[in-house]
Interface confidence: low
């Protein structure tokens, strides 16, 4: 349905508040270094223009595309060249190349200061003084640090952020009320950002077909009673929503997501019995709730898959006539029967099935050739099951911090060229799989663990893509989306790596470590551990454990000392010497 003015159409659909918030997110995700005030000015200008188009859709420039309007506005920024360098060259291009150019310059790891949380009273005063600016600043700071954050979901986070301040700034103990809520929002926000980053990587690096396959598998697990035609419709609509958001079309994305939530709720009888509560909520909560809804119960007495996909004499005919629909049917039928499998495992099975049909349907006796295809699935299923069992046992034995350390050592040995901050961040997140998933019963462990690991390994892939340093990482990241985790699991110690020169400065610590939070102190120690492995990749677990135990004792001792700085200087030298001796450096 063509509209005379796209900007007027979206303004009317979304309302002024959401329109302004989404334009701010879009601009902050594109121009990540621009000051807050500059973005607010640009957003206000766009909003005023949109209002003139609502009043008269035939007014000048109202017929222009949103990319043209927004791109023109971004290109008015005076300091574009000095702040962004070659990104300024995007402005010499025409749409749609200009928008593609802006997208390519999005930075997953922008050089921005860490967000420091002010005192609660300071935050509450700022909230009460100017609530609108306070909330805009939240959107701006999150969006510029997470340039692929799912924009409609960020509106939901902002709503919760506002609710937390509204409630807690009038509580007796403001800090006790507010801080846990902010911690929860921060952790959920990081997880949400990483999950969306995988969706965008899937679309941008592997194409729409890959994303649709993922969506068929996930929605079939979630809505096993829904008919294939229904799942297909949801997949088509969901793909459109995520394609738009990943492409920077945030107004269209938010609008279409609202339409999808409306459709799901109007048709919940034919989709899932679990949607009732979600569908009673307001729009932002409703969309979030649907996205997180638990799997519906599987229909009873589902017949065997073999009849239609192995035993039928028409398998090759069906496959030849409509390959993707037939494979989609296979994936749908397999996934709805297996909520206990990870999505990536289901996709590996579908790929194996596809490869077998490609080979066998050209053979002299196709049925004889593909008759045992389901037997090929067994090792594919057992590999993640065994891996999860082993790692959950290790996690239960070590606890989260030491489990992270084991992964730090493992991954540093696999890909020692990767930067230390990236190895620490990724390994810490990999280690969180333990507390996140190992508590689940067997039937829920694999979908929890392996699909979470896919999200974390994608973080490694996008960070590495910015400054590629390891052929092994590039290979695992680019060859197959669904085989990334098995690819990294299969990597052994990199024998080609030349150990890093020893630098005493890397292992010099100061009294400031004593005032850090437990989490920050862990990161310092884990950074040292990665550096140790880079210096001595062949060090044994026992050697590394001994050095790390000495290091922990050293920090504890000096933090209790009267003259902390002197203790760190003197004891630090002894620790470095002892570590060098222990590791044979």
């Amino acid at each position: 349905d063509a509209h005379k003015s796209e900007v007027a159409h979206r303004f009317k659909d979304l309302g002024e508040e959401n329109f302004k918030a989404l334009v701010l997110i879009a601009f902050a995700q594109y121009l990540q270094q621009c000051p807050f005030e500059d973005h607010v000015k640009l957003v206000n200008e766009v909003t005023e223009f949109a209002k003139t188009c609502v009043a008269d859709e035939s007014a000048e420039n109202c017929d222009k595309s949103l990319h043209t309007l927004f791109g023109d506005k971004l290109c008015t920024v005076a300091t574009l060249r000095e702040t962004y360098g070659e990104m300024a060259d995007c402005c010499a291009k025409q749409e749609p190349e200009r928008n593609e150019c802006f997208l390519q310059h999005k930075d997953d790891n922008p050089n921005l200061p860490r967000l420091v949380r002010p005192e609660v009273d300071v935050m509450c005063t700022a909230f009460h003084d100017n609530e609108e600016t306070f909330l805009k600043k939240y959107l701006y700071e999150i969006a510029r640090r997470h340039p692929y954050f799912y924009a409609p979901e960020l509106l939901f986070f902002a709503k919760r952020y506002k609710a937390a301040f509204t409630e807690c700034c009038q509580a007796a103990d403001k800090a006790a009320c507010l801080l846990p809520k902010l911690d929860e929002l921060r952790d959920e926000g990081k997880a949400s950002s990483a999950k969306q980053r995988l969706k965008c990587a899937s679309l941008q690096k592997f194409g729409e077909r890959a994303f649709k396959a993922w969506a068929v598998a996930r929605l079939s697990q979630r809505f096993p009673k829904a008919e294939f035609a229904e799942v297909s419709k949801l997949v088509t609509d969901l793909t459109k929503v995520h394609t738009e958001c990943c492409h920077g079309d945030l107004l269209e994305c938010a609008d279409d997501r609202a339409d999808l939530a409306k459709y799901i709720c109007e048709n919940q009888d034919s989709i899932s019995s679990k949607l009732k509560e979600c569908c009673e909520k307001p729009l932002l909560e409703k969309s979030h709730c649907i996205a997180e809804v638990e799997n519906d119960e599987m229909p009873a007495d589902l017949p065997s898959l073999a009849a239609d996909f192995v035993e039928s004499k028409d398998v090759c005919k069906n496959y030849a006539e409509a390959k993707d629909v037939f494979l989609g049917m296979f994936l749908y039928e397999y996934a709805r029967r297996h909520p206990d499998y990870s999505v990536v495992l289901l996709l590996r099975l579908a790929k194996t099935y596809e490869t077998t049909l490609e080979k066998c349907c050209a053979a002299a006796d196709p049925h004889e050739c593909y008759a045992k295809v389901f037997d090929e699935f067994k090792p594919l299923v057992e590999e993640p099951q065994n891996l999860i069992k082993q790692n959950c046992e290790l996690f239960e034995q070590l606890g989260e911090y030491k489990f992270q350390n084991a992964l730090l050592v493992r991954y540093t040995k696999k890909v020692p060229q990767v930067s230390t901050p990236t190895l620490v961040e990724v390994s810490r997140n990999l280690g969180k799989v333990g507390s996140k998933c190992c508590k689940h019963p067997e039937a829920k462990r694999m979908p929890c663990a392996e699909d979470y690991l896919s999200v974390v390994l994608n973080q490694l892939c996008v960070l590495h893509e910015k400054t590629p340093v390891s052929d092994r990482v590039t290979k695992c990241c680019t060859e197959s989306l669904v085989n990334r985790r098995p690819c990294f699991s299969a990597l052994e110690v990199d024998e080609t790596y030349v150990p890093k020169e020893f630098n005493a400065e890397t292992f010099t610590f100061h009294a400031d470590i004593c005032t850090l939070s437990e989490k920050e102190r862990q990161i310092k120690k884990q950074t040292a551990l990665v550096e140790l492995v880079k210096h001595k990749p062949k060090a044994t677990k026992e050697q590394l454990k001994a050095v790390m135990d000495d290091f922990a004792a050293f920090v504890e001792k000096c933090c209790k000392a009267d003259d902390k700085e002197t203790c760190f200087a003197e004891e630090g030298k002894k620790l470095v010497a002892a570590s060098q001796a222990a590791l044979g450096l």
């Epitope: 009673k225 829904a226 008919e227 294939f228 035609a229 229904e230 297909s232 009888d269 034919s270 229909p299 589902l302 017949p303 239609d308 039928s312 028409d314 005919k317 069906n318 496959y319 006539e321 409509a322 629909v325 037939f326 049917m329 749908y332 039928e333």
Partner: nanobody, 115 residues
Framework: QVQLQESGGGLVQPGGSLRLSCAAS????????MSWVRQAPGKGPEWVSA????????RYAESVKGRFTISRDNAKKTLYLQMNSLNPDDTAVYYC????????GSQGTQVTVSS
């Protein structure tokens, strides 16, 4: 867009007959097995009958065996259910579905058997 549109339902006396049709669009109809499913008031969906992509292999629920016949015309992209010797227990909304699904994805057609 995958779409299924049922028709042919109505009110019929016990012992009477009806022929249901299901027009398919948006996918290669001839490549898929199809099923008929029904849902009686206040009950869950019940699988009725299935047919393979070529029409050679048909299957029926015990409750309808010998009375119902499933067929298809791939050229017309249409699935049929011939229902004979209808009784009040056959009163339900009837849906056609792709493959082995037992849940509705379309509007269905109402069949009421009553004197």
């Amino acid at each position: 867009q995958v779409q299924l549109q049922e028709s042919g339902g109505g009110l019929v006396q016990p012992g009477g007959s009806l022929r249901l049709s299901c027009a398919a669009s948006g996918f290669t109809f001839g490549s898929f097995g199809m099923s008929w499913v029904r849902q009686a008031p206040g009950k869950g969906p019940e699988w009725v009958s299935a047919i393979d992509s070529s029409g050679a292999d048909t299957r029926y629920a015990e409750s309808v065996k010998g009375r119902f016949t499933i067929s298809r015309d791939n050229a017309k992209k249409t699935l049929y259910l011939q229902m004979n010797s209808l009784n009040p227990d056959d009163t339900a909304v009837y849906y056609c579905t792709i493959g082995q699904s037992i849940s509705r994805g379309s509007q269905g057609t109402q069949v009421t058997v009553s004197s």
